[in-house]
């Protein structure tokens, strides 16, 4: 154990050294460029919405060097207050000259969640066993981004192992929310949320297995989309558990506005991706669905009856509902059935069907970050003790009991049973959706941002997002409002539906939030990413019209 800890300490030193060196290179590169181009209006450049930035790059009104180094400088600057950048992908400077001009993302700097492998770079996931293990090649989506002219320029921070909606690890430390440094940026794509939310990147890629794109997007006031699990390639991604297929991981874009998400999807859903990863269905972006202006039939719910929405969350949904109705859309109350079962049995059971054994292998001899709460300790418990504990706490803490008993390992036969149950559940919800003839669904999204380290002790709050990983439906988030003083005052009366430690932590963790962003979640049926984006764009148009790029 002692020698393991010594190895872990060494990994921390090396990782931080590498992070520091990368940041120094960023600063140098940005300063050099500024000295050579003193007349460049960097503020105006940074304010450009992505579609306009792309247009100016294509028309040669802006040089790709100007865009890259302006964003490198901005990323360096915002990192000082957020600690969101783990490494500078320094070959972005040479990458510039090779970027194909006809690419849909020609000259666009793109930030990458650290799990997207990049040739010659570590993807540590905040774990010491991955430190000093550089990737041999780019992951498929990174390769496709480059083929579309984009310039990946930084890797961003994640919580240790990525099994958290907070963002801290022993190697690179804690990433904080750009709106308020005592708050979490969300996770696990928290570095992306913080960087894009503070203007340090125009576009980023994240991954989502329980809300990992949607939490940081919500907490940091940006837009994010979790597509259907297999719409975008996952080939070459670094993870800490492979082969868990019950709850699907998704790759998706994060950006300041919906149009940027659509542009990213348009770029990725191309022949190159279908060629490089033939396991992805060759479905190009359906422009006619995205640009349609037909009125929508929208299902909505104010609460999932599992996690009580904060006053701001409830208000966000109701104001969005009113605006959608006022714009001519039809809104219909809708709630998927059996949500507790989907979360406690299907999702938790799917994620930990080996009792967490594979997951725990990653922590051997390593420090465990406090942001993970008691997850590692619980998974380390012997099978019989998990069962006994679940039984003992059931009367007082039924939710914790349910999660605990579903974290036990099961046989292959029982796993097949579970996977079949997920299939049946999916068909049930689709049937409910079809019965109401819905196009899309509007749901609350956890907001505002929780205090640092609170997410690890408020596990139940993944309910609004995790449901759609279990169902494998596309789901995106759009910021629609901010917390008011009245919301804050009402939060004093928040008790939750269970009054357990998760509910108590949620109430405590959401205090002092006036002015923080609040989002809603937009959901569509599997493979309907374009419809989901069209709905998100409509919500954005009605709730934050100032964001619409002309």
């Amino acid at each position: 154990r002692w020698s393991g800890r010594r190895t872990a300490r060494g990994a921390v030193v090396r990782a931080r050294q590498r992070q520091r060196a990368g940041l120094e290179n960023m600063d140098r590169a940005a300063q050099r460029f500024r000295l050579q181009n003193p007349d460049l209006d960097s503020e105006a450049l940074l304010a450009l919405p992505l579609p306009q930035l792309v247009q100016k790059l294509h028309s040669r009104e802006l040089a790709p060097e100007a865009v890259l180094f302006t964003y490198v400088g901005k990323a360096w600057e915002v990192n000082k207050g957020t600690n969101c950048v783990t490494s500078y992908l320094a070959d972005c400077e040479t990458q510039l000259s090779q970027a194909p001009r006809q690419g849909l993302l020609y000259g666009v700097p793109v930030s990458l969640k650290e799990c997207f492998t990049y040739k010659g770079q570590d993807s540590t996931l905040g774990l010491s066993l991955n430190e000093g293990v550089p990737a041999e090649c780019d992951s498929v989506v990174v390769h496709v981004l480059k083929l579309q002219g984009a310039v990946p320029f930084v890797h961003t921070n994640v919580p240790q192992s990525m099994f958290s909606y907070d963002c801290s690890n022993p190697l690179f430390g804690q990433t904080v929310n750009p709106w308020k440094s005592s708050k979490s940026p969300g996770g696990s794509s928290g570095g992306e949320g913080a960087l894009i939310g503070s203007g340090g990147s125009p576009l980023g890629l994240g991954t989502d297995i329980g809300g990992s794109i949607r939490f940081p997007s919500s907490f940091c006031g940006i837009c994010g989309l979790k597509p259907t699990g297999n719409r975008l390639s996952k080939s070459g991604l670094k993870g800490c558990v492979y082969g868990q297929e019950a709850v699907r991981l998704s790759v998706g874009p994060m950006a300041r506005d919906v149009e940027s998400l659509a542009l990213c999807l348009r770029a990725l859903l191309c022949e190159d991706m279908f060629r490089l990863d033939p396991t992805v269905p060759p479905l190009p972006f359906r422009e006619e669905v995205y640009t349609s202006s037909q009125p929508l039939r929208v299902g909505y719910y104010e609460t999932d009856n599992y996690t009580m929405p904060s006053p701001a969350m409830r208000r966000a949904v109701l104001e969005t509902k009113q605006s959608l109705e006022a714009a001519g859309h039809t809104l219909v109350p809708f709630l998927p059935s059996n949500i507790p079962h989907a979360l406690e049995t299907l999702s938790t059971g799917g994620l930990f069907s080996d009792g967490g054994h594979t997951f725990l292998q990653n922590f051997k001899g390593d420090f465990v970050d406090p942001c993970l709460g008691d997850l590692v300790s619980i998974l380390k418990l012997p099978q019989w003790l998990k069962g006994l504990l679940a039984f003992l706490v059931k009367p007082l803490l039924p939710r914790l009991s349910a999660f605990l008993s579903n974290m036990k390992s099961r046989s292959a036969g029982k796993l097949w049973e579970l996977q079949h149950e997920i299939e049946v559940y999916r068909k049930t919800v689709i049937a409910q959706w079809r019965a109401l003839d819905l196009d899309v669904v509007l749901t609350p999204m956890l907001a505002p941002a929780l205090d640092l380290n609170a997410p690890g002790r408020a596990t139940g709050a993944v309910s609004y997002t995790m449901l759609y990983n279990c169902l494998d439906f596309p789901a995106g988030v759009v910021p629609v409002t901010t917390v008011t003083a009245e919301d804050e005052a009402q939060m004093e009366h928040y008790r939750g539906y269970f009054g357990d430690i998760w509910d108590k932590m949620l109430q405590k963790g959401m205090k002092k939030s006036v002015g923080l962003p609040v989002a809603v979640q937009c959901v569509a049926l599997p493979w309907q990413e374009e419809l989901c984006l069209r709905f998100m764009r409509e919500v954005e148009r009605l709730m934050t019209p100032e964001k619409q790029s002309s």
């Epitope: 104001e319 009113q322 605006s323 109705e325 006022a326 001519g328």
Partner: nanobody, 110 residues
């Protein structure tokens, strides 16, 4: 809620009109109020809306020309239409809380 629109008519391009929407019932002040329009051979579509908090949203084609407002004390909503164009010709409908008015015709000629 019952809604009655007024103020429509025939106007020359570049001219102005002010539409009113009188609501009976107490829910007017608690709800978003919207104006929609349906031009000849077209689908009905949003023109503008104003929320209970006074937040306004306009469709791109009328931005900077039309102004939506409300007087909660009088249970009335307004649409001030300036710099009218022939393409603004349509039946204009008022909407509050799932209820529609019967519409008022606006015709803009050269």
């Amino acid at each position: 809620v019952q809604l009655v629109e007024s103020g429509g008519g025939l106007v020359q391009a570049g001219g102005s009109l002010r539409l009113s929407c009188a609501a009976s019932g107490r829910t007017f002040s608690d709800n978003t109020m919207a104006w929609h329009r349906q031009g000849p051979g077209k689908q009905r579509g949003l023109v503008a809306f104003i929320t209970t908090g006074g937040r306004t949203v306009y469709t791109d084609s009328v931005k900077g020309r039309f102004i939506i407002s409300r007087d909660n004390a009088k249970n009335t909503g307004f649409l001030q239409m300036n710099s009218l164009k022939p393409e603004d010709t349509a039946v204009y409908y008022c909407y509050v809380a799932g209820n529609w008015g019967q519409g008022t015709q606006v015709t803009v000629h050269h």
